[in-house]
């Protein structure tokens, strides 16, 4: 009876129809399983753990961008349970390569040790 329910649907035994799994609020993630016709009895939403965020719906919580450690950039806006961190300009001693295609992480800062001569962020 439930084989045709979608990714985020369970089979509601009261109506005989597929029904949307209850979506989570921003800052929460699903706990246990719901979808493709079944819903765990304990299915619900739980707050994101520290250093993670979620936009809600059926998203799991994801780790905030590590601006300083990975991107070697300053923190423009720290992340919270609902929003990712936003990175600002490069840390001292690092520069951003212009005209370089964005990778999946956005722009990454590179060490001034590898910079071409007269790179403005690395002069002085």
């Amino acid at each position: 009876e439930d084989s045709n329910c979608g990714e985020n649907e369970y089979h509601n035994q009261t109506t005989g129809l597929c029904q949307q799994c209850p979506p989570c609020r921003p800052g929460e993630e699903p706990y246990m399983s719901c979808g493709y016709g079944t819903k765990d009895d304990d299915y619900g939403c739980v707050p994101c753990p520290a250093e993670k965020f979620s936009k809600g719906g059926y998203q799991i919580c994801r780790r905030h961008k590590d601006c300083e450690g990975f991107f070697r950039a300053t923190v423009l806006t720290p992340g919270d349970m609902e929003n990712d961190a936003e990175c600002g300009p490069c840390l001292p001693g690092y520069y951003m390569l212009e005209n370089r295609p964005r990778n999946i992480y956005g722009m990454v800062c590179y060490s001034c040790l590898l910079a071409p001569p007269n790179t403005k962020e690395c002069v002085g």
Partner: antibody
């Protein structure tokens, strides 16, 4: 008296979209799911999907997932269906139907008069 | 999806005759809750469908007792004991046990 009043006939061009309405009266709008059913010319009935007016949650037949968008306006007790990227295959009569469920009964107990959609250039 | 097969597709009758329409499903319509969600709808000319029989054999409110439904599992029958003029139209069987709900192709009850 429970009634579902549907909007008038539509003549639309291929590739365009169309939005039809179904105004409910005579009952608690948020207490029943509203379903949409397609009847192609001289053919049988096909279930498109439903919307729960209480919370706007929808579920659709896989066949119509990219074709139909279901919405409601609780303040006017009106359900809507929008069909996009229309082709001649979408020419049909579209019915809204109230879905009764309770005591493990479930069925379409009230139907609108239908909206005829003709897709033609 | 569950396929609903109706026979015959056309049924010529005279007023006062008995009429019988068959409906067969491609899989059992017995729900895990024990109910069988096989319904019959009538679409009179130029009108929208109306519910006649729900859950195999239960007449919907206002439906005359000349209409009766029977069957189980995958085989179902709608009978009209004495056909009246207002009974003419297209009869659809429909299942609501499995998702999505599906309908038969319809049986047109018409005068000989």
């Amino acid at each position: 008296e429970v009634q579902l009043q549907q909007s008038g006939p539509e003549l639309v061009k291929p590739g365009a979209s169309v939005k039809m309405s179904c105004k409910a009266s005579g009952y608690s709008f948020t207490g029943y799911n509203m379903h949409w059913v397609k009847q192609s010319h001289g053919k049988s009935l096909e279930w498109i999907g439903y919307i729960d007016p209480y919370n706007g949650a929808t579920s659709k037949n896989q066949k119509f997932k990219g074709k139909a968008t279901l919405t409601v306006d609780k303040s006017s007790t009106t359900a809507y269906i929008q069909l996009n990227s229309l082709t001649s295959e979408d020419s049909a009569v579209y019915y809204c139907a109230r879905y009764y469920y309770g005591d493990y009964h479930w069925y379409f107990d009230v139907w609108g008069a239908g909206t005829t959609v003709t897709v033609s250039s | 999806d569950v396929v609903m097969t109706q026979t015959p597709l056309s049924l010529p009758v005279s007023l006062g005759d008995q009429a019988s329409i068959s409906c067969r499903s491609s899989q059992s319509l017995v729900h895990s809750n024990g109910n069988t969600y096989l319904h019959w709808y009538l679409q009179q000319p130029g009108q929208s469908p109306k519910l006649l029989i729900y859950k195999v054999s239960n007449r919907f409110s206002g439906v005359p007792d000349r209409f009766s439904g029977s069957g189980s599992g995958t085989d179902f029958t709608l009978k009209i004991s004495r056909v009246e003029a207002e009974d003419l139209g297209v009869y659809f069987c429909s299942q609501h046990t499995h998702v999505p709900p599906t309908f038969g192709a319809g049986t047109k009850l018409e005068l000989k």
